[in-house]
């Protein structure tokens, strides 16, 4: 019987019957054996087929069998009821093998001429499976030449049997206090050759609370407990299961915060599994009762192991831990079943006794001595001598524990001295160099240092005067020594100041004429206001239509009198402001340099000379009725004039305050 | 990890002021409590000072009332003790605290003597 | 003033041993009362915040208790390392007051 073909050679070929294409002989039988490659199967198909007709081919017939398997008893020519011929079928080997046996009996009716047929081998397509059989492979089959291999979906990984798809279904940890979890593809079936274990982590002090839902069904035997597929539960104290079946197994109450969840399965059966939602529990934490006057968020039925609460206190109120303030407050539910922090009190908000205002007073409105939350209270400042600055003085004890005004703010009021009163009031007049009574000058300062000068207050805690006066001090503020309050110049009786700093216009050039003749001196202490000390006001804008040519103005000072000593008590003098350019002409002959007047200076004096100021009055006042507030205000500083204090046709000439108001607001805002 | 350091002088005179500043690191002193000073004298005895809350409020010791300011600067993370008119009984090592104590700085050892 | 009274200056204990602190309040504070442990040449660290609270990082062998008056810190099982004065504070009303400190010794 030729054997055909073997792999490795090329395996096609052709077969007929022999005689063909004539006609075959009686008593004839032939066996082919054709071997393909592993993975490789045969292909067949007849090209020609004429062979005697039998009931069940039993007289001739072409047997093709693969294995153990007939495929096909063909004979006569073309197919009946219980006899089949191949026609145009094609005939495949189910393995890498194919016997073909040719046999006819002891005689024919006719001659029959037999057949022919060609062979080839082709690759086997593992993949493709027929209708009711099990698949090549669990998940993915991929198909080559003379084989197949499988994959798996992610989340797996192929079995050692090179066909099985076990889950990656290990080391999962669940840490919430409540979840799900289920078996891999759960409701569909679970996979096969898998062992999955799930563990559930909590805190210390949680009881970890199982319960198996919506339907359980794992591969059971009738006699055997679970030895196919199988759950286990494992706790650190106990283990639960195994289970399997189709009965949802009852809620199991840990006790544990530990929970071990085992799923080992077979390589066989069809089941969905299962799925587990658990809780926790643990010891509850006592009801935490809000404070008076506050609440707890979030109200809850219970607080247990981690839950929190905070305290809120009603508007007006503050936490407070004792004597301690507290911005917010939350305790959290220990294991032992106590909370982390004590219960704080909420205590009406209490904005404490009100700071005392400099040159001012405070007046309990609510009741005496009450400082708690929406309590008022009333400043006010030491009347004729000072009025408040910026509000009406009235505050309220608010919410965040500050003491607040109408306009909300914070900070205390000032109590502003108030400027430009004098005990004296002016008729207009000219007259005589006269002595100044108490309260007449009241911003009259005496400057010490080197030389005789005078100065004005401003506010109460900085004095106006010429840069001239203090110029030598500059860089040592303190050996300046600054006195007010008294009449008598040599008097031990006066008030006392000291200099912080000296600020000089940034445009004096000392001994290079007296523009820009203007400094102030900060004192280190504000001085108290009264009767006989008073600021000076500042000109206001509208100021200038109280300083025309020929308005009066009234110069002080401790300067040379006629005697040509300076005076002990304080001299006061009223006098005229000058036309500029006339003022100007006079100091254009010699030994004035040309331009020593400047638009930042104003004269003063009669033309007819008498009545000026003089040395040691360099610094003071030259002041003005403002009458629409009745308020004195500085329009001029002692600044500088002819040798000869008094002499006709020479006016004394003062700084211009008007033209440095600016000047003068930024170094005192600044300062 | 939230810390707290003193600085100051070390000697003053008698009749000076003291100022000391304590700097917060790891926590906003606006966040929350109550930021003291506290004193501890030579024998060990302390006293609290007073002290500057989340919110700038501040309480203090009525013996100390009229000579003591706890201010602060929330930009730079500080808060301050002003003691003025100082004499040798206020040589003391100062602290500053948190809230009841629960952190305290390594305090400073301040003299006082001409 | 609320003052704090720590009776004991001095005591003495063996390592292993339970020893009580005690500190009485010249009027009622509530449960406002802290304790603190000072090792020399460091600064005060609290153990024990209102009466009981165990502050955090703190051995649990410290244990706080008492309202009212009367408060009693106790360390169980006491370790060299307890060497220190102990002082204990109210926090409940202004000003906030000390005790004059309890110093432990170990035999």
């Known amino acids: 019987t030729p054997l055909g073909p073997k792999w490795p050679e090329p395996v096609f070929g052709r077969l007929a019957s022999p005689g063909f294409p004539g006609e075959y002989a009686n008593d004839q039988e032939r066996r082919w054996t054709l071997t393909a490659p592993p993975g490789y199967r045969l292909r067949l198909y007849f090209t020609h087929f004429d062979l005697e007709l039998s009931h069940l081919c039993e007289y001739d017939f072409v047997k093709l069998s693969s294995g153990a398997k007939v495929l096909a008893t063909l004979c006569g020519q073309e197919s009946t009821d219980t006899e089949r011929a191949p026609g145009k079928d094609t005939f495949y080997s189910l393995g890498s093998s194919l016997d073909i046996t040719f046999r006819s009996d002891y005689s024919n009716e006719k001659p029959f001429t037999g057949f022919e047929a060609f062979y080839a081998a082709e690759d086997i397509d593992e993949c493709q499976v027929a209708p009711g059989e099990a698949p090549t492979c669990d998940h993915h089959c991929h198909n080559h030449l003379g084989g197949f291999y499988c994959s798996c979906r992610a989340g797996y990984v192929l079995h050692r049997n090179k066909r099985t798809c076990s889950a990656l279904c290990s080391g999962q940890v669940f840490t919430q206090r409540s979840g799900e979890l289920s078996s891999p593809e759960y409701p569909r079936p679970y996979p096969k050759l898998s062992s999955c274990t799930y563990s559930i982590s909590l805190e210390e002090g949680f009881s970890v609370i199982l319960d198996f839902v919506e339907s359980f069904d794992v591969e059971t035997h009738p006699e055997t407990l679970c030895p196919y597929d199988f759950l286990k539960i494992q706790t650190d104290r106990e283990e639960h299961g195994p289970f399997c079946g189709k009965t949802l197994p009852h809620r199991i109450e840990t006790k544990s915060n530990t929970v071990t969840i085992t799923f080992v399965t077979d390589e066989s059966g069809d089941h969905t599994g299962w799925k587990i939602h658990y809780t926790s529990t643990a010891q509850p934490c006592p009801y935490p009762m809000a404070p008076p006057n506050g609440h707890v968020s979030p109200v809850q039925a219970k607080y247990i192991l981690k839950d929190s609460f905070s305290i809120f206190c009603e508007t007006g109120y503050e936490l407070l831990q004792g004597h301690l303030p507290l911005k917010s407050f939350t305790a959290v539910c220990q294991k032992d079943g106590s909370w982390d922090r004590p219960m704080p009190a909420c205590s009406i908000v209490d904005c404490g006794p009100p700071d005392d205002l400099p040159s001012g007073r405070v007046e309990y409105i609510t009741g005496p001595g009450v400082t708690t939350y929406k309590a008022v209270i009333q400043y006010s400042c030491e009347e004729t001598f000072y009025t408040m600055k910026v509000n009406d003085g009235k505050y309220v004890c608010e919410a965040d524990g500050f003491w607040t005004s109408s306009k909300g703010e914070k900070s205390l009021p000032v109590c502003e001295p108030v400027c430009g009163l004098s005990a004296r009031t002016t008729g207009g007049r000219i007259y005589g160099g006269q002595k100044a009574k108490p309260g007449d000058f009241p911003w009259q300062v005496l400057i010490l240092g080197g030389t005789t000068a005078a100065g004005a207050l401003l506010y109460d805690n900085w004095v106006l005067t010429a840069a001239h006066a203090v110029y030598e001090q500059k860089h040592d503020a303190s050996a300046l020594d600054i006195r007010m309050g008294t009449l008598k110049r040599l008097s031990p009786h006066y008030t006392q100041a000291w200099s912080e700093a000296v600020f000089i216009h940034e445009g004096y050039t000392h001994d290079a004429g007296f523009d820009n003749d203007i400094a102030l001196i900060k004192l280190n202490n504000k001085v108290v206001i009264n009767s006989n000390i008073t600021p000076i006001c500042l000109p206001r804008k509208e100021a200038e239509s109280f300083m025309r040519t020929d308005d009066i103005g009234t110069a002080s000072g401790w300067g040379l009198t006629q005697r040509g000593f300076l005076a002990r008590n304080l001299m006061y003098v009223d006098i005229p402001i000058v036309d500029h350019q006339k003022c100007t002409a006079a100091y254009e002959k010699p030994p004035y340099p040309r331009g020593s007047v400047t638009a930042n200076m104003l004269c003063a004096g009669l033309e007819s000379g008498g009545k000026d100021s003089c040395r040691g009055d360099s610094g003071g006042a030259l002041v003005f009725l403002d009458s629409e507030t009745e308020r004195w205000f500085v329009g001029g500083i002692v600044s500088w004039g002819s040798m000869n204090c008094g002499e006709a046709g020479q006016y004394g000439v003062y700084t211009k305050v008007i033209n440095y108001i600016p000047w003068i607001e930024n170094i005192i805002s600044d300062f | 990890q939230m810390q707290l350091q003193e600085s100051g002088p070390g000697l003053v005179k008698p009749s000076q002021s003291l100022s000391l500043t304590c700097t917060v690191t790891g926590y906003s002193i606006t966040s929350d409590y109550a930021w003291n000073w506290i004193r501890q004298f030579p024998g060990n005895k302390l006293e609290w000072m007073g002290y500057i809350s989340y919110s700038g409020r501040t309480s203090y010791n009525p013996s100390l009332k009229s000579r003591i300011s706890i201010t602060r600067d929330t930009s730079k993370n500080q808060f301050f003790l002003q003691l003025n008119s100082v004499t040798t009984e206020d040589t003391a090592t100062y602290y500053c605290?948190?809230?009841?104590?629960?952190?305290w700085g390594q305090g400073t050892t301040l003299t006082v003597s001409s | 003033d609320i003052v704090m009274t720590q009776s004991q200056k001095l005591m003495s204990t063996s390592v292993g041993d339970r020893v009580s602190v005690t500190c009485k309040a010249s009027q009622n504070v509530g449960t406002n009362v802290a304790w603190y442990q000072q090792k020399p040449g460091q600064s005060p660290k609290a153990l024990i915040y209102s009466a009981s609270y165990r502050n955090s990082g703190v051995p649990d062998r410290f244990t706080g208790s008492g309202s009212g008056t009367d408060f009693t810190l106790t360390i169980s099982n006491v370790q060299s390392e307890d060497l220190a004065e102990y002082f204990c504070?109210?926090?409940?009303?202004?000003?906030?007051?000390f005790g004059s400190g309890t110093k432990l010794e170990i035999k």
């Open positions: 504070q109210q926090f409940n009303t202004n000003p906030l007051t």
């Open positions: 605290a948190r809230h009841y104590g629960d952190y």
